[in-house]
C-alpha cells in the first residue's frame, strides 16, 4: 500500500524550490523499478516530482492567503511491466501560514459621538481589525489593540478594540478628539505587523453652563408718553453650551411697581424689557428692577448645574415730557 | 540523447531586437525547466532567464528585466528568448540550459554549444 | 543576490596532482550547489550538483563537499582533460548566480 505522510509547504518561501515530502509504496525496495507518478491541478507547474525516488518538489512561490490546499493523485508505476503498483490516490499538500499579512481596519472612517462630561468607562465605539493570516496558524492573526493617540481621555480594551472614555471631557473647552489605534497581530510579540486607524470623537453638548448675564448693571430709558407694550430696551446673557441647551428664558424677579415685563426673543437669545403700564414722571422718575434667566430644557440630572439663576439689575429712567 | 541546438544570434545595432532559439530533443521538454545563460567574451558565466516546464513560472536577471523575454512551446519542444532593447553589455555568447530532476529542477544539465550575439553600432 | 566567491583564480599543478577549489557563498545555500567545467570555445558541462553529486558520466575522481556556505571540488589525481575553467553555481535562490571561476593549468 501507499505510504502516506502529511504533506506541507511554507507560503512565500524564497528558495528557488522547497521539498515537500515524497510519495512511497511499502512496495518500492529501491531498486529503481518503480516510477511515480503525480497529476492533478499544479502538478508540473507548482509542484513537481522526481519520477525515480517519489520526492515532491514545489517549484513556485506559493501564497497561502490566495490557495491554502492542493489536492493531486498519485500513481506507482513499475517500469519493467508498465502496470500500476498501486490504486491511484488522493492525497493533498497544504500550504502553511507565515505571518506575511499586516491587520487591516476594514470600516474605516471611524466616527463616533458621546455626550461630553460622561463618565470614565462609557463605550465610545469598538473598532476592529482583521488579518488574513491562518487564525488557527500559532499567533499570526490573534491582535492586540493599543492607543497610539488620545490618552488620557481614552483607552482601548486590547483584546476586543473597545474604545471607552477615561477621563471626563468638557466640551466647551474641546469639541472633539482624533484617537489613533493600533492593531498589531503576533499579540504584540517581536515580529508582529501592525495596522492603524483614525477614530475622530465628537463631544456631543449636554446642558453643563448656566446661562449669565453680561453685565450685573443695565441702564435703560422711558418716555413718560411711551404706551403700554412699548419696548424700551433690551438685555443679554450668554450661555456657553450649544443649540436647545443655550436656548434662555428671561423674566422679572423683582419689580415692586409691577410696570415692567420681561419677553425673550428666541432668536436672537435676548431679553426684551416692555412697559406693562405707562409711567409718569411726575410721579416716579426712576424704577429699579431685578431680571433673571434661565435655560429653557434643564434634564433632572443637570439641575446641580443650575441651581441658582443669574440676574442683573435693570435701573430704568423715566423722561420728562412737556405736558400741555 | 539529449541535444540543444540554440540559433538566431547575429550583429545587432544597439536599441535593436533578436530572438534566439533554442531546439531541444531526446526528453520530453514540457517536464523540465530551461535556462538562458550568457557568456561574455573573454569573462565568466551570467544567468539571464529560467522558464518551468509547461512556462508557468518565468524568471529574469535584474540586467535584463523589462527588456528580454523568455518562452517555449511544447508542441515544437523549443525555448525561446526575445531581446529588445539591446546594449553593447549584451554581447555574449548565448547558451540554454537544460534543468534536471526533483531537487536539481532549476539546474543546469545538458547545455547547447550557444549562439552568438553581438550588439555593436 | 547571492554572491558567489571562488579561489584560488589561478591553480597551477602537475600530472597527477590533487586539485582542491573552493567555493563560498554570501550566505547559506545549502547544499544547492553546482559545479561545471569548461574548455576553451566549449559549452560548460555539469560535474557535481546536489554539493556532492556527480551527474552521468563523470568519473570518481572528480568529488563535491561542503554545505551552507563553503564548498569544495577535489579532483584527486589529475588528468590531462581536467585542465580547464571551473564554475560554481547556487540554485538556491533567484536570482542564480555562477561564481568567477578557476583556471586549473599545467605547471
Known amino acids: 500500500g501507499w505510504v502516506w505522510n502529511q504533506f506541507f509547504v511554507p507560503e512565500e518561501m524564497n528558495t528557488t524550490s522547497h521539498h515537500v515530502g515524497r510519495l512511497r509504496s511499502d512496495l518500492d525496495n529501491g531498486n529503481n523499478s518503480f516510477q511515480y507518478k503525480l497529476l492533478g491541478a499544479g502538478a508540473g507547474s507548482t509542484f513537481i516530482i522526481d519520477e525515480r525516488t517519489g520526492d515532491i518538489y514545489a517549484i513556485e512561490k506559493l501564497d497561502r492567503e490566495e490557495r491554502s490546499l492542493y489536492i493531486l493523485r498519485a500513481q506507482v508505476i513499475d517500469i519493467t511491466t508498465g502496470r500500476a503498483v498501486e490504486p491511484e490516490s488522493e492525497f493533498v499538500i497544504k500550504v502553511s501560514d507565515i505571518n506575511d499579512n499586516e491587520p487591516k481596519f476594514l470600516d474605516e472612517p471611524y466616527e463616533a459621538i458621546v455626550p461630553e462630561m460622561s463618565p470614565e468607562g462609557t463605550l465610545v465605539i469598538q473598532v476592529t481589525a482583521s488579518d488574513a493570516d491562518d487564525p488557527s496558524s500559532g499567533n499570526n492573526a490573534r491582535l492586540l489593540y493599543s492607543l497610539l493617540q488620545g490618552q488620557p481621555y481614552f483607552s482601548v480594551e486590547p483584546t476586543t478594540g473597545v474604545i471607552r472614555i477615561s477621563s471626563k471631557m468638557d466640551r466647551e473647552l474641546q469639541d472633539e478628539y482624533w484617537v489613533i489605534i493600533q492593531a498589531k497581530d503576533m499579540i504584540g510579540q517581536p515580529g508582529a505587523l501592525s495596522g492603524t486607524t483614525s477614530v475622530l470623537i465628537k463631544l456631543s453638548d449636554v446642558n453643563d453652563n448656566k446661562p449669565i448675564f453680561k453685565e450685573s448693571l443695565y441702564r435703560l430709558t422711558v418716555s413718560e408718553s411711551a404706551p403700554t407694550g412699548t419696548s424700551i430696551g433690551t438685555i443679554m446673557a450668554y450661555d456657553n453650551d450649544i443649540g436647545e441647551n443655550a436656548e434662555m428664558d428671561y423674566s422679572i424677579e423683582e419689580d415692586d411697581s409691577q410696570t415692567f415685563d420681561i419677553i425673550t426673543n428666541h432668536e436672537t437669545q435676548e431679553g426684551i424689557v416692555i412697559l406693562k403700564k405707562k409711567v409718569n414722571f411726575e410721579h416716579q422718575n426712576h424704577y429699579g428692577i431685578r431680571a433673571k434667566v434661565k435655560n429653557h430644557h434643564v434634564d433632572e440630572q443637570l439641575m446641580k448645574y443650575h441651581t441658582e439663576a443669574s440676574t442683573t439689575f435693570i435701573k430704568i429712567q423715566v423722561e420728562d415730557v412737556d405736558e400741555p | 540523447e539529449v541535444q540543444l541546438l540554440e540559433s538566431g544570434g547575429g550583429l545587432v545595432q544597439p536599441g535593436g531586437s533578436l530572438r534566439l532559439s533554442c531546439a531541444a530533443s531526446g526528453f520530453t521538454f514540457s517536464s523540465y525547466a530551461m535556462n538562458w545563460v550568457r557568456q561574455a567574451p573573454g569573462k565568466g558565466l551570467e544567468w539571464v532567464s529560467t522558464?518551468?516546464?509547461?512556462?508557468?513560472?518565468?524568471y529574469y536577471a535584474d540586467s535584463v528585466k523589462g527588456r528580454f523575454t523568455i518562452s517555449s512551446d511544447n508542441s515544437k519542444s523549443t525555448l525561446y528568448l526575445q531581446m529588445n532593447s539591446l546594449r553593447a553589455a549584451d554581447t555574449a555568447v548565448y547558451h540554454c540550459a537544460k534543468g534536471g530532476m526533483g531537487g536539481y529542477y532549476y539546474g543546469m544539465d545538458v547545455w547547447g554549444q550557444g549562439t552568438t550575439v553581438t550588439v555593436s553600432s | 543576490e547571492i554572491v558567489m566567491t571562488q579561489s584560488p583564480v589561478t591553480l597551477s599543478l602537475s600530472l597527477g596532482e590533487r586539485a582542491t577549489l573552493s567555493c563560498r557563498a554570501s550566505q547559506s545555500i545549502s547544499s544547492n550547489l553546482a559545479w561545471f567545467q569548461q574548455k576553451p570555445g566549449q559549452a560548460p558541462r555539469l560535474l557535481i550538483y546536489g554539493a556532492f553529486t556527480r551527474a552521468t558520466g563523470i568519473p570518481a575522481r572528480v568529488s563535491g563537499s561542503g554545505s551552507g556556505t563553503e564548498f569544495t571540488l577535489t579532483i584527486s589525481s589529475l588528468q590531462s582533460e581536467d585542465f580547464a575553467v571551473y564554475y560554481c553555481q547556487q540554485y538556491n535562490y533567484w536570482p542564480l548566480t555562477f561564481g568567477g571561476g578557476t583556471k586549473v593549468e599545467i605547471k
Open positions: 522558464i518551468s516546464g509547461g512556462g508557468a513560472n518565468t
